[in-house]
Amino acid sequence: ITQQDLAPQQRAAPQQKRSSPSEGLCPPGHHISEDGRDCISCKYGQDYSTHWNDLLFCLRCTRCDSGEVELSPCTTTRNTVCQCEEGTFREEDSPEMCRKCRTGCPRGMVKVGDCTPWSDIECVHKESGTKHSGEAPAVEETVTSSPGTPAS
């Protein structure tokens, strides 16, 4: 996911709605003009603001990367919601890309957790119940099972 914090607003195009600030703040979906006199609407699909604010610029919409699906589009008041495609996941320590989930557990282990957009399948030892470290096993060692469906 890529996002820049501030999207400098170009000169207000005719279609950009203007209204007056209320107690110095502009409503969600707007930002304040430099002179503080007007509220200028964010551009749908390009930028947004989430709260009553005195921001000089709206925030730039996130664009989903390839390998991600867009669950909810960017509106003037909400950012995009992106999620890894089915069968892939994004780890906390490598948030920059979606990685393929393993298709099965090593021999002697059982699957106790499905592939989700945030985690690989979870495997535990049959006897001890201890978790597997997470390294993908060699193909001939796997007990295959279909990856879980990402939560929508």
Epitope: D5, L6, G24, L25, P28, Y48, T50, H51, W52, N53, D54, L59, T62, L71, S72, T75, T77, R78, N79, T80, V81, A151, S152
Partner: antibody
């Protein structure tokens, strides 16, 4: 991992001002896009949003409490604070601080909460 | 203000049960709704945002659905750690408002 911790007196006398502070760790209060809120929960009841502040100091309050509420921020200490004036027994509640996620989808991190009792 | 009507206010269920909690809004919210779990002595946890998106780290047995005025939180197979109180939050318009809560108890 962002963590929020409320602090302040657990007992306040009627007509006085309730003062609480929320200390943020694991992230900067000045990180763009995040708004910082106070929420309260009356004993055995539901949750009520009080208001929020942005790191720049701009605030927005629940109209039902607006006349009595002040929220302020101290970016150097990574803290934001709540003041509620002219308290009565009806202000007895657990007070929570929380962070609004920067994408506009509500609160993503909450504090543990602090019980404040208004009694003489 | 937008009123959020949550039902039921409490329910008793067993481990393994499928549990459904509903929130109705007094006006349309698009998908500007979240679900939260509250346990005594624990930090309140967001489960679902944008009506149906699962928060990172939340088990996939939790799911959310709905848009407009009617929303549902479903726990597909209740686990011992799921006994808690659940709240919905509308953040479509200020002031943001919560449902009254649903306490999920052990049968």
């Amino acid at each position: 991992q962002v963590q929020l911790q409320e602090s302040g007196p657990g007992l306040v006398k009627p007509s006085q001002t309730l003062s609480l502070t929320c200390t943020v760790s694991g992230g900067s209060i000045s990180s763009g896009g995040h708004y910082w809120s106070w929420i309260r929960q009356h004993p055995g009841k539901g949750l009520e949003w009080i208001g929020y502040i942005y790191y720049s100091g701009s605030t927005y309050y629940n109209p039902s409490l607006k006349s009595r509420v002040t929220i302020s921020v101290d970016t150097s200490k990574n803290q934001f604070s709540l003041k509620l004036s002219s308290v009565t027994a009806a202000d007895t509640a657990v007070y929570y601080c929380a962070r609004d996620d920067s994408s506009g989808w509500g609160f993503d991190y909450w504090g543990q909460g602090i019980l404040v009792t208004v009694s003489s | 203000d937008i009123q959020m009507t949550q039902s039921p206010s409490s329910l008793s269920a067993s481990v393994g049960d499928r549990v459904t909690i509903t929130c109705r809004a007094s006006q349309g919210l698009r998908n500007d709704l979240g679900w939260f779990q509250q346990k005594p002595g624990k930090v309140t946890k967001r489960l679902i945002y944008a009506a149906s998106s699962l928060q990172r780290g939340v088990p996939s047995r939790f799911s959310g659905s709905g848009s407009g005025t009617e929303f549902t939180l479903t726990i597909s197979s209740l686990q011992p750690e799921d006994f808690a109180t659940y709240y919905c939050l509308q953040h479509y318009s200020f002031p943001w408002t919560f449902g009254q809560g649903t306490k999920v108890e052990i049968k």
